[in-house]
């Protein structure tokens, strides 16, 4: 805390300049009107003030907004929105993309911290969903963005919103969160050709059900080894031997070398052995000729 | 990596003179505005003298008229000429991008003026 001082003589700011930089912080204090400063914000991000004189600043700020600063000065904020905490945060109604645009450029190339998260936290409540433009912009600051978010959060992205995600935008996602957002790609993509859907619906891939990927074997897609690790096994184990082969196409070759990972290794363990065999890849685990397989999960659902 | 290492503090009597080297590497220094700091014992810091790549200077209203500020770039390194020096110099200078805003921080060269 800047002690409370006079300001000398002459040294009254009549504006937020340049010559601001030479002020100590009981200077800065004692000269600089809090009204002028949240009136002329836009032109602080552009004077290299130390980060102790940001936090006099800062400072005078919290003394005049004690409530949460008002749009039109958190807009123009720059390097002093790194001085923020999160409930310096909480306190501010954003609405407007262009401002949430503003900060993010500041903490641009740094990892997502926890005021970053708390403006995104504030910014799309606010919006009630997040809607296109607003993933955009933040996939675009935060590659990992969407897959931060909780399967209840993620309910809230419309449809529409999916073609603005990346691939590498799903990178961490959990077969939790592509559950809820395949459905939506799906939806988003359902009027694209076969060729182009599988180009979109690919990154997704990890939260489709078992009949989605029997309907995608028939269309020739050639899905690669990569995708297919990433498919849930639950809805892998019940497709046929002839199916995999149909989804993979050429690809299938790189089933040998994953054949003890999952869900490949599991999936081996529910196919005929002889069918396997047809394959010619040498993927043993299958179930030997003359085995009766019973699936007690249907006989349960039949009584 | 941003390197600066100041160097020429010393010693001196009041009215004298002193000049200081700030030699930097690690980013492009003719790009790059530049700032003389200094931190007094039990005081703050305050910023002494600014020098910007297109070379337009600015100082401090204490030290205005007796220090200089000035830069060479063939060798990555910025000057700060004193004179007229009194005992109210004393402190520890750093010099600094004026883009990093972290002001007085580091070794920095110290520099005693004694009546």
């Known amino acids: 805390e800047v002690e409370k001082t006079a300001c000398p003589s002459g040294k009254k700011a009549r504006e937020i300049d340049e010559s601001l930089i030479f002020y100590k912080k009981w200077e800065l204090e004692a000269c600089v009107d809090a009204a002028l400063l949240a009136t002329q914000m836009d032109r602080v991000n552009a004077i290299p003030f130390t980060y102790e004189q940001l936090d006099v600043l800062k400072h005078k700020l919290d003394e005049l907004y004690p409530q949460g600063y008002p749009e039109s000065v958190i807009q123009h904020l720059g390097y002093l929105f790194l001085k923020m905490s999160p409930e310096d945060i909480r306190k501010w109604n954003v609405t407007s993309l262009e401002t949430l645009k503003a900060l993010l450029e500041v903490n641009k190339g740094h990892e997502m911290s926890p005021q970053v998260a708390t403006l995104i936290d504030r910014f799309v409540k606010g919006r009630g969903q997040l809607d296109k433009d607003t993933l955009d912009t933040l996939t675009a600051f935060y590659p990992g963005y969407l897959c931060s978010l909780s399967p209840e959060e993620l309910s809230s992205v419309p449809p529409s919103s999916i073609w603005a995600v990346r691939p590498q935008d799903l990178d961490t996602c959990d077969p939790r969160q592509l559950d809820v957002l395949y459905p939506k790609a799906r939806l988003a993509f359902q009027n694209m050709n076969g060729s182009e859907y599988f180009v979109k619906i690919q990154s997704f891939l990890g939260g489709a059900p078992t009949e989605d990927l029997k309907a995608l074997s028939q269309q020739n897609v050639s899905m690669d080894l990569a995708t297919f690790m990433k498919l849930r096994t639950d809805a892998v184990l019940p497709l046929t031997v002839a199916e995999v082969q149909k989804l993979l196409g050429p690809h299938v070759e790189g089933l040998k070398a994953e054949e003890r990972h999952r869900p490949v290794r599991d999936w081996i363990l529910r196919q005929r052995q002889d069918d396997l065999d047809t394959l010619g890849l040498g993927l043993q685990g299958g179930i030997p000729n003359g085995y009766l397989v019973l699936d007690l999960s249907m006989q349960e659902a039949l009584s | 990596e941003v390197e600066l290492v100041e160097s020429g503090g010393g010693s001196v009597q009041a009215g004298e003179t002193l000049r200081l080297s700030c030699t930097a590497s690690?980013?492009?220094?003719?790009?790059?505005?530049m700032g003389w700091y200094r931190q007094a014992p039990g005081d703050e810091c305050e910023l002494v003298s600014t020098?910007?790549?297109?070379?337009?200077?600015n100082y401090a209203d204490s030290v205005k008229g007796r220090f200089t500020i000035s830069q060479d770039n063939a060798k990555n390194t910025v000057y700060l000429q004193m004179t007229s020096l009194k005992p109210e110099d004393t402190a520890i200078y750093s010099c600094?991008?004026?883009?990093?805003?972290?002001?007085?921080w580091g070794q920095g060269t110290l520099v005693t003026v004694s009546s």
């Open positions: 690690g980013f492009t220094f003719d790009d790059s505005d």
């Open positions: 020098i910007s790549s297109d070379g337009s200077t």
């Open positions: 600094r991008t004026m883009a990093s805003r972290i002001g007085c």
